[in-house]
């Protein structure tokens, strides 16, 4: 009686179970009563990443430099190429089809997490006692200067965008 289901890594064709092609190979011809499944390796810049019965291999992804992309990991016959973004850019989606520039943290905000090729900058507000006077994708909030440790006094209080201004003791009101 012909099988209705086949084992793992097999497929049903013409009422018989044939072996699937291994990753990195495509199907040339199905098995018969007398012959095994015929498979061929994928060509250069092609891949298949699963046990399959595909007659064509997939093309490796192209990391288009015009979109800010570069190769992070070169594809093999069994894996696709992985693209990432050039320095200063990050992917717009998980599949990384294009890139956009990293966001800068505005004055009054510091970098909480520096951007990577796949994630944008995360900013946080500078709390009291800290400041940032620049727009930057790298700088954290910096602490206000301690006038006391310099034997000076505060002449002007700091803000989230400006440092404290220190002055000599005798200038104190």
């Amino acid at each position: 009686e012909p099988p209705t289901a086949c084992r793992e890594k097999q497929y049903l064709i013409n009422s018989q179970c044939c072996s699937l092609c291994q990753p990195g190979q495509k199907l040339v011809s199905d098995c018969t009563e007398f012959t095994e499944t015929e498979c061929l390796p994928c060509g250069e810049s092609e891949f298949l990443d699963t046990w399959n019965r595909e007659t064509r291999c997939h093309q490796h992804k192209y990391c288009d430099p015009n979109l800010g992309l570069r190769v992070q990991q070169k594809g093999t016959s069994e894996t696709d190429t992985i693209c990432t973004c050039e320095e200063g850019l990050h992917c717009t989606s998980e599949s990384c089809e294009s890139c956009v520039p990293h966001r800068s943290c505005l004055p009054g905000f510091g970098v909480k997490q520096i951007a990577t090729g796949v994630s944008d900058t995360i900013c946080e507000p500078c709390p009291v006692g800290f400041f940032s006077n620049v727009s930057s994708a790298f700088e954290k909030c910096r602490p206000w200067t301690s006038c006391e440790t310099k034997d000076l006094v505060v002449q002007q209080a700091g803000t989230n965008k400006t440092d404290v201004v220190c002055g000599p003791q005798d200038r104190q009101r």
Epitope: G110, K112, Q113, E124, P125, C126, P127, V128, G129, F130, K140, C141, P143, W144, S146, C147, E148, V153, V154, Q155, Q156, A157, N160, Q172, R173
Partner: antibody
Framework: QVQLVQSGAEVKKPGSSVKVSCKAS????????IEWIRQAPGQCLEWMGS????????NYNQKFQGRVTITADTSTSTAYMELSSLRSEDTAVYYC???????????????WGQGTLVTVSS | DIQMTQSPSSVSASVGDRVTITCRAS????????????LAWYQQKPGKAPKLLIY???SLQSGVPSRFSGSGSGTDFTLTISSLQPEDFATYYC?????????FGCGTKVEIK
């Protein structure tokens, strides 16, 4: 020990101004922030503003900007909060409190004045 | 401005009870550089000024009984009284001091059941 002593209760007419004082002792007045907070009957605590007496630097709550003026006299270790254009909704207890002491590490209010009741009524 | 929301607005409890008060901020009060939480808790009794209990979300102010404790980070904070005493019946306020303007929660009144 740290002490903040405020001026007595006031009754004011709508449209007028009130000036509340807060005399500090037991710590270095010039290098510690004085904060002003108010509490209307049955309402939340509301921060109004602050001053660093040694420099005269101030911070104000935008809600009161233009109506509140905070000053300090280092020679008498006294801070003042003046609120102008009074209306009935300004009826509240006004508190001064000590804030950061120059360490940039103690912005919470560890000592409070006893409070000054300001009643605005025609 | 950072909004502070306290819950519940009141709680009835008996002496010896464990009481938990929560406070939620409209934005994170945890700063990544020093990992500090810019939050304080105060106790206020009728006709009196507020009294500092907890600062940096979990540090106990000197002289405050150890039955008071604070916890939390980011936007969610808790004040716990492990075993309520008669003198603890009061109103409790949270306050952030992350950035100006400082704001307070509207309080939780702990009443006798």
């Amino acid at each position: 020990q740290v002490q903040l002593v405020q001026s007595g209760a006031e009754v004011k007419k709508p449209g007028s101004s009130v000036k509340v004082s807060c005399k500090a002792s037991g710590y270095t007045f010039s290098t510690s922030w004085i904060e002003w907070i108010r509490q209307a009957p049955g309402q939340c605590l509301e921060w109004m503003g602050s001053i660093l007496p040694g420099s005269g630097s101030t911070n104000y709550n935008q809600k009161f900007q233009g109506r509140v003026t905070i000053t300090a006299d280092t020679s008498t270790s006294t801070a003042y909060m003046e609120l102008s254009s009074l209306r009935s909704e300004d009826t509240a207890v006004y508190y001064c409190a000590r804030g950061d002491d120059g360490s940039y590490n103690r912005w919470y209010f560890d000592h409070w004045g006893q409070g000054t009741l300001v009643t605005v009524s025609s | 401005d950072i909004q502070m929301t306290q819950s519940p607005s009141s709680v009835s409890a008996s002496v010896g009870d464990r009481v938990t008060i929560t406070c939620r901020a409209s934005q994170s009060l945890t700063f990544s550089v020093n990992q500090k939480n810019y939050l304080a808790w105060y106790q206020q009794k009728p006709g009196k000024a507020p009294k500092l209990l907890i600062y940096w979300a979990s540090s106990l102010q000197s002289g405050v009984p150890s039955r008071f404790s604070g916890s939390g980070s980011g936007t969610d904070f808790t004040l716990t009284i492990s075993s309520l005493q008669p003198e603890d019946f009061a109103t409790y306020y949270c306050q952030h001091y992350y950035s100006y303007p400082w704001t307070f929660g509207c309080g939780t009144k702990v009443e006798i059941k």
